[in-house]
């Protein structure tokens, strides 16, 4: 099995995690993709997923999680906005390819969210003109439920994360709780 590597990201409450997961566009452009959390001793749980088939650059919002799948660039963008301490944990991007096991996109993200004022710009932040507007017509996709083995033998591409906290306020409307749907029974 492939060694699972992870990168640690330490953020403050209220900041945004911005993750970019690369994939082979010719293979997986229209495949359904998901953002999962891995808790100690448990199977990965899906927090949000794209539609099936995945739509190009069409945002899907589940609570404070926004997924955008860019087919032309072979990239899944995952944002977790207004982070809370309880969001701390280990995350990963996966590509669903039933009946085969999910294709995992490494590296896993070790997210550590701490309390504290997040108003001071971080090293990855950009200008005051950076604004996040979450579209009001985002879609909530239904994530599949199916059993899959624990092991992954194929070495996939990697993912990475970026901290992004625009000075402008993040305006989320009609936000629901994060849905945690287990992918593995």
């Amino acid at each position: 099995a492939t060694k699972l590597t992870e990168e640690k990201y330490e953020l403050k409450e209220g900041q945004t995690l911005d993750v970019k997961c690369d994939y082979t566009l010719e293979k997986f452009a229209s495949s359904q993709k998901a953002w999962q959390i891995i808790r100690d001793g448990e199977m990965p749980k899906t927090l949000a997923c794209t539609e099936r088939p995945s739509k190009n650059s069409h945002p899907v919002q589940v609570g404070r999680i926004i997924l955008e799948d860019y087919h032309d660039h072979g990239l899944l963008r995952v944002r977790m906005v207004n982070l809370q301490v309880e969001d701390s944990g280990l995350y990963q991007c996966v590509i669903y390819q039933p009946p085969k096991e999910p294709h995992m996109l490494f590296d896993r993200i070790r997210l550590v969210v701490t309390k504290g004022f997040s108003g001071t710009p971080g090293s990855n932040e950009n200008s005051t003109q950076n604004v996040y507007k979450i579209p009001p017509t985002t879609t909530k996709a239904l994530c599949p439920l199916y059993t899959s083995p624990r092991t992954v033998t194929q070495a996939p591409p990697k993912s990475t994360a970026d901290v992004s906290t625009p000075d402008s306020e993040i305006n989320l409307t009609n936000v629901t709780d994060i849905i945690r749907v287990p992918v593995f029974n």
Epitope: K20, S57, E68, H73, R77, N130, V131
Partner: antibody, heavy 117, light 107 residues
Framework: EVQLVESGGVLVQPGGSLRLSCAAS????????MSWVRQAPGKGLEWVAN????????YYVDSVKGRFTISRDNAKESLFLQMNSLRAEDTAVYYC??????????WGQGTMVTVSS | EILMTQSPATLSVSPGERATLSCRAS??????LAWYQQKPGQAPRLLIY???IRATGIPARFSGSGSRTEFTLTISSLQSEDFAVYYC?????????FGQGTKLEIK
């Protein structure tokens, strides 16, 4: 045919302003992040700015923040770069490129901006 | 800002031989790295994204490898049209940066 065509590059004095335009065709412009990348004579590539499909996110390299503004008109399939307070170090070929969420997969042929007195 | 450093600045290789270009990031960019080719008077062309995934239409002789901070672009058997300048680019954070370029010339 997929095409990005830049225009607006001229000789301008330091402190002056300029607006670059990029006309897109053959791509789904309204679905694409777009960017400006520049290249000073004999030098390497430098990303300048990018903009999301709906204009809701814009990012800039530090050296142009507060001076340059990226914008777009999806109805006209056009990308713009408003350049104010120009400096000699802004002299470069400016490329319009599709992308900005990650890579730049389609490029124009560039327009030359010269800042000199 | 993530600094991207390419080496060597110039690489002289004979046609048919193998060329290996390196790119180092000042901090981890995971797999968020791309390679471009640029010929004189032309716009750059995307070759590789995700550190190792060939862009559409790119010949199989081009391959990318590496992750985090160390990356390599390999051209297995150089063709005459491959002599150009090659740039790496990271897109991990929103302050995108390119390497200074490696000029691949005919030996």
């Amino acid at each position: 045919e997929v095409q990005l065509v830049e225009s607006g590059g001229v000789l301008v004095q330091p402190g002056g302003s300029l607006r670059l335009s990029c006309a897109a065709s053959g791509i789904t412009f309204s679905n694409s992040w777009m960017s400006w990348v520049r290249q000073a004579p004999g030098k390497g590539l430098e990303w300048v700015a990018n903009i999301k499909q709906d204009g809701s996110e814009k990012y800039y390299v530090d050296s142009v923040k507060g001076r340059f503004t990226i914008s777009r008109d999806n109805a006209k399939e056009s990308l713009f770069l408003q350049m104010n307070s120009l400096r000699a170090e802004d002299t470069a070929v400016y490329y319009c490129a599709r992308g900005g969420i990650s890579t730049f997969d389609i490029w124009g042929q560039g327009t030359m901006v010269t800042v000199s007195s | 800002e993530i600094l991207m450093t390419q080496s060597p600045a110039t690489l002289s290789v004979s046609p048919g031989e193998r060329a290996t270009l390196s790119c180092r990031a000042s901090q981890s960019v995971s797999s968020n790295l791309a390679w471009y080719q640029q010929k004189p008077g032309q716009a750059p062309r995307l070759l590789i994204y995700g550190a190792s995934i060939r862009a559409t239409g790119i010949p199989a002789r081009f391959s990318g490898s590496g992750s985090r901070t160390e990356f390599t672009l390999t051209i297995s058997s150089l063709q005459s049209e491959d002599f150009a300048v090659y740039y790496c680019q990271q897109y991990k954070n929103w302050m995108y940066t390119f390497g200074q370029g490696t000029k691949l010339e005919i030996k």
